[in-house]
C-alpha cells in the first residue's frame, strides 16, 4: 500500500498497530485519494476533450456510480451518522471496481492510479473497524464485477475516455460528501 | 440563533462526582459533533471530550479518561459530561462546544460556561 | 497539560497591525491544516476567528488572516481597533489529543 505524506509506514501496511477510529487518519486519507484523482483527472483532461462536455451530456451515461442522495443520511439536513456511515463503505466498496477499471487507462499516472486504488482499499478498512452496523453493509457480487469490468473494457476509446472521467468526477464529488460528513463522526 | 446553555456546575468536593448538562437550541443538533472544553481560574482553554453526531464515537483527555464520560441525547438536544472522582485541578468553567459542521477540529459556536469548582 | 507556544502579550496602537505567533511542532501545527484562532473578549466565552489555518469564520472582518510556515501558525490583525483587546487562542489536532490550544495571547491596543 502506498505511504501518505506525513505517515508513518508501518500506519498504512499493518492497519492495526493504531487505534482506528482516528478521525485524523480517515481525513488525511481522503484528502490524499483527492490529490490522486486531481493529479489523474488532469492527465484525462490533456488527453481528451472530455472535461469540456456538458454536465447534461456526460449524465446520458448507463453507469450506475455510487452517490449521495438525501435518503443516505451524509448531508447537513437530515445527517444521521450510522446511516451515512455505512453509505460511504457501501459506496466505496462499489467503487472498487471502477477504479479496477481505471488501472490500465493512465501512461505517465500509471502509478498514481495504482495509489488511489490502494489508499480506497485501506480507507475501507479504517471505516469498516469505525462502523458498528456492519450487517448493513453489502458488498458487490464478484461475478457482477467481473462482468462489469468486461463490458468497460469493451467500449470503444470515446465511451473509454467519457467512462474514465466519469469515475473521476464521481469518485471526487463522493469521496467531498464523504469528507464532510466524517469530520462529524 | 445557535444557543448553547450549561448548567449542572456548582461546588464538589475532591472524589465527588457532577453531571453537566448542555441544552442546544437553534439547530439541527444530531448533526454535529460536540465537546467539552474548560478553562481554570486565569488559565488557558484545554480540550476534555469530544463526541460524534451520533454518540458512536467518544475521545478523551488523558487527564479525564477513565474518570468523565460524555454522552449526548439528540432526542431531548443535550450533551451531558459525567464527571466522576472529582480532583481540584479539575475546578474550571466548562464550555459546551459545537464543531463547525465539515470542518475538521474548529469550534463555531461556544456556550457561555458553567462553574465547577472542586474543594474541600 | 502541554500546549502551544504563544508569546503571553502583545500590543499596538489603533490602525496599527499585530501578529500573533503559535509556536507547535510537526506533531501539531507542522502536521496539517487543522489550525484555529479564537477570540476571547473580558468575561465571554471564545469566538472562532480563524479555522483550517487561513480561512475566516462566518461574520468576521477580513482584518483578521492567518497563516502558517512550518510548525508556526500566525494570526495577524490589521487596522487595530480598540474593541480587539481580548486573549486571542490558537488549537491545533494533534495526534491522540484531538485538539490542543495555546496559552493564550493578551492583545492590549494602546491609548
Known amino acids: 500500500a502506498p505511504v501518505l505524506p506525513g505517515e508513518d509506514s508501518k500506519d498504512v501496511a499493518a492497519p492495526h498497530s493504531q487505534p482506528l477510529t482516528s478521525s485524523e487518519r480517515i481525513d488525511k486519507h481522503i484528502r490524499y485519494i483527492l490529490d490522486g484523482i486531481s493529479a489523474l483527472r488532469k492527465e484525462t483532461c490533456n488527453r481528451s476533450n472530455m472535461c469540456e462536455s456538458s454536465k447534461e451530456a456526460l449524465a446520458e451515461n448507463n453507469l450506475n456510480l455510487p452517490k449521495m442522495a438525501e435518503k443516505d443520511g451524509c448531508f447537513q439536513s437530515g445527517f444521521n451518522e450510522d446511516t451515512c456511515l455505512v453509505k460511504i463503505i457501501t459506496g466505496l466498496l462499489e467503487f472498487e471496481v471502477y477504479l479496477e477499471y481505471l488501472q490500465n487507462r493512465f501512461e505517465s499516472s500509471e502509478e498514481q492510479a495504482r495509489a488511489v486504488q490502494m489508499s480506497t482499499k485501506v480507507l475501507i478498512q479504517f471505516l469498516q473497524k469505525k462502523a458498528k452496523n456492519l450487517d448493513a453493509i453489502t458488498t458487490p457480487e464478484p461475478t457482477t464485477n467481473a462482468s462489469l469490468l468486461t463490458k468497460l473494457q469493451a467500449q470503444n476509446q470515446w465511451l473509454q475516455d467519457m467512462t474514465t472521467h466519469l469515475i473521476l468526477r464521481s469518485f471526487k464529488e463522493f469521496l467531498q460528501s464523504s469528507l464532510r460528513a466524517l469530520r462529524q463522526m | 440563533e445557535v444557543q448553547l446553555v450549561e448548567s449542572g456546575g456548582g461546588l464538589v468536593q475532591p472524589g465527588g462526582s457532577l453531571r453537566l448538562s448542555c441544552a442546544a437550541s437553534?439547530?439541527?443538533?444530531?448533526?454535529?459533533?460536540m465537546s467539552w472544553v474548560r478553562q481554570a481560574p486565569g488559565k488557558g482553554l484545554e480540550w476534555v471530550s469530544r463526541?460524534?453526531?451520533?454518540?458512536?464515537?467518544?475521545y478523551y483527555a488523558d487527564s479525564v479518561k477513565g474518570r468523565f464520560t460524555i454522552s449526548r441525547d439528540n432526542a431531548k438536544n443535550t450533551l451531558y459530561l459525567q464527571m466522576n472522582s472529582l480532583k481540584p485541578e479539575d475546578t474550571a468553567v466548562y464550555y459546551c462546544?459545537?464543531?463547525?459542521?465539515?470542518?475538521?477540529?474548529?469550534?463555531?459556536?461556544w456556550g457561555q460556561g458553567t462553574q465547577v469548582t472542586v474543594s474541600s | 497539560q502541554s500546549v502551544l507556544t504563544q508569546p503571553p502579550s502583545v500590543s499596538g496602537s489603533p490602525g496599527q497591525t499585530v501578529t500573533i505567533s503559535c509556536a507547535g511542532t510537526s506533531e501539531d501545527v507542522g502536521y496539517g491544516n487543522y489550525v484555529s484562532w479564537y477570540q476571547q473578549l473580558p468575561g465571554m466565552a471564545p469566538k472562532l476567528l480563524i479555522y483550517d489555518v487561513n480561512k475566516r469564520a462566518s461574520g468576521i472582518a477580513d482584518r483578521f488572516s492567518g497563516s502558517k510556515s512550518g510548525n508556526t501558525a500566525s494570526l495577524t490583525i490589521s487596522g487595530l481597533q480598540s474593541e480587539d483587546e481580548a486573549d486571542y487562542y490558537c488549537a491545533s489536532y494533534r495526534r491522540t489529543i484531538d485538539n490542543i490550544f495555546g496559552g493564550g495571547t493578551h492583545l492590549t491596543v494602546l491609548g
Open positions: 437553534g439547530f439541527t443538533f444530531s448533526s454535529y459533533a
Open positions: 463526541i460524534s453526531s451520533g454518540g458512536i464515537s467518544t
Open positions: 462546544v459545537r464543531y463547525a459542521w465539515g470542518v475538521q477540529w474548529a469550534f463555531d459556536f
